[in-house]
């Protein structure tokens, strides 16, 4: 009996342990290659996928080209944004470019916006080569509230890489704020 | 398909102002630089200079540079330019013209004669 | 400006033979390798047309009897063999570097 109720308990905390781990957020979101805007100035990246190819979410929310927070806790953020430019696609208006995404953080009780991660670098992409490419990676630990939303933006949104494996952004919870 | 259609022939006295338009169809008229290149009578090919339209970024040739302007309306997919203080040596056909999807100007307007004289 | 050289100005060649127009640029118009020298034909009255782009690429629906080659500062545009319907004049033209410029010209006489 006691074998059994150990047994029963120790299955018992193994469902628990999973239900939590199903049940910690996170979202994997691909950028959606159909609504790029264009231009070189600064812009918000609005409209990504959640819920094709590689993107996925769970207990966090998408909406308004924002991913929401819905649980508090200790979030590990991450971003991969890809620039590209294949001469067969016209021409570069300036072959000076800056080419940045920034992680922005925006909080709805105390209306707010703050740059998490940033990250980039300037370019020299001559108008004499045939390819360009450029891919910037920023990743960081950061306390989330509940409510609190996260959105990408990006310079010249014209020369982004519009395939779900080099434009993307996501969220996991790692731990409770204690 | 690329078509670029220029305006008809001007007639002008020297020291006066021409603009001649060119007007753009078959692509997105914003990512390519537009170029401009003219041919005087029984003479070779002059490049002048050229337009980006998207944000309007300009490049010209130095002999150029101070009495002549392109613009673009992107609303209209149309080009401009215009050359002032004209003598009788600009007295030309004028080309607008188009780099193809590699290298190379693969696309070319009708042309527009420009013709100065007193 | 980098100027380009052309010759001869003017050649005439029997139907059937060869034609080869030289072009020498001031300096190299090469860079990221490639040539950034292209060949165009003019006929009277019409604007020209692109035979040939960075240096050796035909052009779609250009016939095989024109070829380019060259690199750096000597190209040169061949027409094997000429047919009545080539006498036109010829331009080379380099976009390496601002501003672009074009070659004099080569006037071909069909004889």
């Known amino acids: 009996i006691r074998a059994e109720k150990a047994m029963v308990d120790g299955s018992w905390l193994d469902l628990a342990k999973r239900s939590k781990l199903e049940a910690q957020p996170f979202a994997h979101l691909t950028i959606n290659a159909t609504d790029i805007p264009s231009g070189s100035h600064k812009v918000s990246l609005s409209s990504w996928y959640h819920d094709r190819g590689w993107a996925k979410i769970s207990n966090m929310t998408f909406s308004n080209g924002k991913l929401i927070v819905n649980q508090d806790g200790f979030y590990y953020l991450y971003a991969n944004i890809c620039f590209r430019h294949h001469e067969t696609s016209g021409d570069l208006a300036t072959e000076y470019l800056q080419l940045m995404v920034y992680v922005t953080k925006t909080s709805i009780k105390i209306p707010s916006s703050h740059t998490l991660m940033k990250g980039g670098s300037t370019k020299y992409w001559s108008g004499n080569s045939e390819f360009h490419f450029y891919s910037i990676n920023v990743g960081g630990f950061f306390k989330l509230r509940s409510g609190e939303e996260i959105s990408i933006e990006v310079s010249n949104p014209s020369l982004l890489d519009p395939d779900q494996d080099a434009t993307y952004f996501g969220a996991f919870k790692v731990r409770d704020i204690d | 398909q690329v078509q670029l259609v220029q305006s008809g022939a001007e007639l002008k006295k020297p020291g006066a102002s021409v603009k001649l338009s060119c007007k753009a169809s078959g692509y997105t008229f914003t990512t390519y630089w537009l170029q401009w290149v003219r041919q005087a009578p029984g003479q070779g090919l002059e490049w002048m200079g050229a337009i980006y339209p998207g944000p309007g970024n300009t490049k010209y040739t130095q002999k150029f540079k101070d009495r002549f302007t392109i613009t673009a309306d992107k609303s209209k997919s149309t080009a401009y330019m215009q050359l002032n203080s004209l003598k009788s040596e600009d007295s030309a056909v004028y080309y607008c013209?188009?780099?193809?999807?590699?290298?190379?100007?693969?696309?070319w307007g009708q042309g527009t004669l420009v013709t100065v004289s007193a | 400006n980098i100027v380009l050289t052309q010759s001869p100005a003017s050649l005439a060649v029997s139907l059937g033979q060869r034609a080869t127009i030289s072009c020498r640029a001031s300096?190299?118009?090469?860079?990221?390798?490639?040539?950034?020298m292209h060949w165009y034909q003019q006929r009277p009255g019409q604007p020209p047309t692109l035979l040939i782009y960075l240096a050796s690429n035909l052009e779609s629906g250009v016939p095989v009897r024109f070829s380019g080659s060259g690199s750096r500062t000597d190209f040169t545009l061949t027409i094997d063999p000429v047919e009545a319907d080539d006498a036109a004049t010829y331009y080379c033209q380099q976009d390496n570097e601002d501003p672009y410029t074009f070659g004099g010209g080569t006037k071909l006489e069909i004889k």
């Open positions: 013209a188009r780099r193809g999807s590699r290298r190379g100007i693969a696309y």
């Open positions: 300096e190299s118009v090469d860079s990221y390798g490639r040539s950034f």
